[in-house]
């Protein structure tokens, strides 16, 4: 709809879409995983939340320096954890605050398992049953 | 000409819920925004937030704490604006507007025990 | 959320002489897209509010060219050549770059 230059108009808003990806990684403890998150464009900070559980409420994820890193560039933000551990077992989200509206925009978020609580096979059921 | 007709006066009691409708006519209803704004007695404007009728996406103002709700009937082109948890502050004129340019007619929505 | 102030209150005019009402945010109103959503409304007594002026300047379709509007950034103004006895009213300045889309406080004009 249009907003007839009164206002901007959220439709217009660049980042007014967020998609993540993947949705699911399985990895041994110690291997590196890179999730992203792709935007229409750079038109504002993304940081990267973290909950352990499905139930909960995901919190702002505490960087641990030398094995976490996020890096954005236009419409690319990616979030690499080297060496991972069972601690970091969990559901990742970026999210995206617009420049000029303060409207906030969420992927759907990236689940990691850290190999050696369960099988594979477990965790690929699990998936289809998320999905 | 672009038009917007607005429901009547409501007297409501406090904790209640209210429903304002607004019927548009004179252009393409799914073009544009409409806005919900409310104006005190003798205060000022206040903006509520918007939907836009074409795939009922809005956008409301944090301050109203999730009790507005804005909803619309294509079928009829009309847009509904919805606030409940109603109290004494909630006295005011509610106007719709399309995009702060049209404005409709307001309805008086009077809050009292 | 965007706080706009406008001064004066009031302003208690002559017909024929000008005024002027000034209108300042608390943050800039340039959007990335170069674009000011700066608005002006008058709301007569009794009546709804009516659009005046949108993109800090365009006048809206039948608006009298007596009204002129200006500004950049934070600060903005509303000017009126020639006040005539139809102008009174109270005047908002609104902007529309931030959300929520906040108002002034309002200016009351009156004629003398």
């Known amino acids: 709809a249009r907003s007839e230059d009164r206002y901007r108009n959220p439709k217009g808003s660049a980042c007014s879409r967020i998609w993540q990806s993947p949705r699911f990684i399985a990895r041994k403890r110690g291997f590196t995983v890179k999730m992203h998150c792709y935007m229409n464009s750079a038109s504002g900070n993304v940081s990267w939340l973290w909950k352990q559980e499905m139930d909960e409420n995901p919190q702002q994820l505490k960087l641990e320096k030398g094995r976490m890193e996020e890096s954005q560039n236009e419409s690319l933000a990616t979030l690499t954890i080297q060496g991972i551990r069972f601690e970091d077992n969990g559901i990742y989200f970026c999210q995206q605050k617009c420049n000029n509206t303060s409207e906030v925009y969420q992927g759907c978020g990236t689940e990691l398992r850290v190999m050696g609580f369960s099988t594979l096979a477990q965790l690929k059921q699990r998936n289809t049953l998320k999905d | 000409q672009v038009q917007l007709v607005q429901s009547g006066a409501e007297v409501k009691k406090p904790g209640a819920s209210v429903k304002v409708s607004c019927k548009a006519s004179?252009?393409?209803?799914?073009?544009?925004?409409v806005n919900w704004v409310r104006q005190a007695p003798g205060q000022g404007l206040e903006w509520m937030g918007m939907?836009?009728?074409?795939?009922?996406?809005?956008h409301y103002n944090q301050m109203f704490n999730d009790r507005v709700t804005m909803t619309v009937d294509t079928s009829t082109s009309t847009v509904y604006m919805e606030l409940s948890s109603l109290r004494s502050e909630d006295t005011a004129v509610y106007y719709c507007?399309?995009?702060?340019?049209?404005w409709g007619q307001g309805t008086l929505v009077t809050v009292s025990s | 959320d965007i706080v706009m102030t406008q001064t004066p209150l009031s302003l208690s005019v002559t017909p024929g002489q000008p005024a002027s009402i000034s209108c300042k945010s608390s943050?800039?109103?340039?959007?990335?897209?170069?674009?000011?959503?700066l608005n002006w409304l008058l709301q007569k007594p009794g009546q709804s509010p009516q659009s005046l002026i949108y993109?800090?300047?365009k006048l809206d379709s039948g608006v009298p060219d007596r009204f002129s509007g200006s500004g950049s950034g934070t600060d903005f103004t509303l000017k009126i050549s020639r006040v005539e006895a139809e102008d009174v009213g109270v005047y908002y300045c609104?902007?529309?770059?931030?959300?929520?889309?906040?108002f002034g406080g309002g200016t009351k004009v009156e004629i003398k």
């Open positions: 993109l800090v300047s």
């Open positions: 004179g252009y393409t209803f799914t073009d544009y925004w």
């Open positions: 939907i836009d009728p074409s795939d009922s996406e809005t």
């Open positions: 609104w902007q529309g770059t931030h959300f929520p889309l906040t």
């Open positions: 943050q800039s109103l340039l959007d990335s897209e170069g674009k000011t959503y």
């Open positions: 507007t399309r995009s702060n340019y049209y």
